[in-house]
């Protein structure tokens, strides 16, 4: 019989109200043995996966998703879900990220949610986490 998977938890560091241009890290936590953590936003419409999972305690694992420079488009509802083979867990509760104007900060009216949320272990200069979708035309990326 498959084990019942506990719901994950979600938190944000340093908090859920972030000045424009500042950084925020979402922390997803679940049981040990998690293979993939997924940070979903806005009712499953988009998500970001990572398998860069660390052990937070003897009974918990976690993954951290960092947005280096928060934009207005990053505001919204976020939640976590995890994959512990052979199945996905239920979703965590929602966490709402609010972005507040910092005086003199650049206006950022993007409608597409920023995609720079990635595990803190990842470099931040890769197309996987940049705001624009990766395009073969932008870099000489090939598979052969």
């Amino acid at each position: 019989q498959e084990e019942d998977l506990p719901r994950p938890s979600i938190s944000a560091e340093p908090g859920t109200v972030i000045p424009l241009g500042s950084h925020v890290t979402f922390v997803c936590r679940g049981p040990v043995g998690v293979q993939t953590f997924r940070l979903e936003r806005d009712s499953r419409s988009t998500y970001n996966d990572t398998e860069d999972v660390s052990q937070a305690s003897p009974s918990e694992s976690e993954a951290r998703f960092r947005i280096d420079s928060v934009r207005e488009g990053n505001a919204g509802l976020y939640r976590c879900i995890y994959y512990k083979p052979p199945k996905w867990s239920e979703q965590s509760d929602y966490l709402e990220l609010l972005v507040k104007e910092s005086s003199g900060g650049p206006d950022s009216p993007d409608t597409e949610p920023g995609s720079s949320a990635g595990p803190t272990q990842r470099p931040s200069d890769n197309s996987h986490n940049e705001h624009a979708p990766a395009s073969q035309g932008l870099k000489a990326e090939h598979l052969y």
Partner: antibody
Amino acid sequence: ESGGGLVQPEGSLTLTCTASGFSFSNSYYMCWVRQAPGKGLEWIGCIYTGSSSGTYYASWAEGRFTISKTPSTTVTLQMTSLTAADTATYFCSRKLTNFNGAYLDLWGPGTLVTVSS
Amino acid sequence: ELVLTQTPASVEAAVGGTVTIKCQASQSIYSYLAWYQQKPGQPPKVLIYKASTLASGVPSRFKGSGSGTEFTLTISDLECADAATYYCQNNNGGSDNTFGGGTEVVVK
């Protein structure tokens, strides 16, 4: 992709995919997809290029197909107990999963595997 | 196991016309669907991801819609260059990366 060619029934073959212009340290999924002559696309499986190297397979591929990677830029597909039904062009592709969506954004040209005696 | 059913298997339309391709999932996949175009002898190319978001460099004549179990790809103002086979794919992760059976578009 490389390593394709003619192989005997019940034989084995390993295909190799090499990435250029991006690094596996950025934690992508690298996937294999195949296409039999005149048929549709069939997903085989993916491997995560980050530290966990987690693998995922289509149910039909589990056991006979093994995906692995080197730390830098190479992914392999090991195939065993091949039959004529495995004759296909095998594509390597990169899967993005981020807030812009999830999709296979980069593809190799494909390598043909023919299983015949 | 998830199944994606694409209809029709083949469709023919005139230059300047409109083609609609449907993709039905056997269970909800939310918005985790991408559409690809493949021409003979070439690897597929992504057109639409997240069910309705146009990939970089793809003309706005291509439109994706739907969520849950019902998805549609609409190609308007057909051009000869649109003659190809089109595939939908679930991208939910885990072992759910299934492709639909494909739809061949013939442009007259």
